[in-house]
């Protein structure tokens, strides 16, 4: 069996998805990573609605999505297409800053503390969300 | 408890290959990542692989990538490493344990001696 | 990679005694960190993970600290089945790396 018919312990079920909230932090590529050994991906926002659920469970923290221009364009993780979909900057964001000292641009897209987007530094160690589809993998086999 | 017991290991030549099997019981083996850690004789421990619990990702270590391929088959709740190309600095007993930070099972370990 | 340096290499003490060991990281790690203890021709065993957290079943009298490049592991009243070898490892970036391993010994 290889459908997923409920979130694993400790993730949270909305809309068919399961969402892991992390309470530390880790650069962009490292939670990156994390996700994937969790079968997931860093969270991909697709609508007004899930944007509201996310925000209400990190709080008013920098915390990384699945969005990134590290190879140009901005990309979602998963494949989901950024210019036709939703989106949250702050206002004059994305900017690409190079004024931080540390090298390069910003080609990361984290949640500020008032939810809307930012990039920023991709080796900022920020707290981050997986998120999974569910009927997309499973851990337990179904019931014959 | 989980209990993690490997094997497949042994006397191979330079250049030659192994297969090692970690056979897990005691919890929900297909929730968990998976990773191998492996101790040169008289030497520290040093981590050689890991997979995610449905085999979706993996990662390695510089000194195995190419040559290494972990895998997993939850049906049999069994862990795999295909190890090709073999050197002798990776002479080691080679552990399986579980999970993707810090990993709380792990097996006996199992000797892989390279040599001619 | 992250380099994990251990201090000392090896330490004498003796029952009852109070032990620290250090471990450096090369870069920060935030509390990226977990602590083993390996006796001769056994498995690591986990004392600690998440830098301070003590892992189920393991005696209060180890515990750890630290954050960022500097962590430290206490054991607060030495016993005899204490005596081994302890090594830290970072789970901030990959790989994975170990430090070289502290050996508490008996004096």
């Known amino acids: 069996g290889s459908e997923r018919t409920c979130c694993p312990v400790n993730w949270v079920e909305h809309e068919r998805s399961c969402y892991w909230f992390s309470r530390s932090g880790k650069a962009w590529a490292d939670a990156d990573n994390y996700c994937r050994l969790e079968d997931a991906h860093l969270v991909v926002v697709t609508s007004w609605e899930e944007q509201k659920f996310v925000q209400h469970h990190i709080g008013p923290v920098n915390t990384w999505m699945g969005l990134h221009d590290q190879n140009g364009p901005w990309k979602w993780v998963d494949g989901t297409d950024y210019e036709t979909g939703f989106k949250n900057w702050r206002p004059e964001q994305p900017d690409d800053w190079y004024g931080h000292g540390l090298g390069g641009g910003e080609d990361c897209a984290h949640f500020t503390d008032d939810g809307r987007w930012n990039d920023d530094v991709c080796q900022r160690p920020y707290r981050w969300v997986c998120e999974t589809e569910l009927d997309k993998a499973s851990q337990e086999p179904p019931l014959l | 408890e989980g209990q993690l017991l490997e094997s497949g290991g042994g006397l191979v030549q330079p250049g030659g290959s192994l297969r090692l099997s970690c056979t897990a019981s005691?919890?929900?083996?297909?929730?968990?990542?998976m990773t191998w850690v492996r101790q040169a004789p008289g030497r520290g421990l040093e981590w050689v692989s890991v997979?995610?619990?449905?085999?979706?990702?993996?990662f390695y270590a510089d000194s195995v990538k190419g040559r290494f391929t972990i895998s997993r088959d939850n049906t049999k709740n069994t862990l795999y490493l295909q190890m090709n190309s073999l050197r002798a600095e990776d002479t080691a007993v080679y552990y399986c344990?579980?999970?993707?930070?810090?990993?709380?099972?792990w097996g006996q370990g199992t000797l892989v001696t390279v040599s001619s | 990679d992250i380099l994990m340096t251990q201090s000392p290499s090896s330490v004498s003490a003796s029952v009852g005694d109070r032990v620290t060991i250090t471990c450096r990281a090369s870069q920060g790690i935030i509390n990226w960190l977990a602590w083993y203890q390996q006796k001769p021709g056994k498995a690591p065993k986990l004392l600690i993970y998440a830098a301070s957290s003590l892992q189920s079943g393991v005696p209060s009298r180890f515990s750890g600290s630290g954050s960022g490049t500097d962590f430290t592991l206490t054991i607060s009243s030495l016993q005899p089945e204490d005596f081994a070898i302890y090594y830290c490892?970072?789970?901030?970036?990959?790989?994975?790396?170990f430090g070289q391993g502290t050996k508490v010994e008996i004096k």
């Open positions: 997979i995610s619990g449905r085999g979706g990702s993996s």
């Open positions: 344990a579980k999970d993707q930070l810090w990993f709380d099972y």
């Open positions: 005691g919890f929900t083996f297909s929730t968990f990542a």
């Open positions: 490892q970072q789970a901030n970036s990959f790989p994975w790396t």
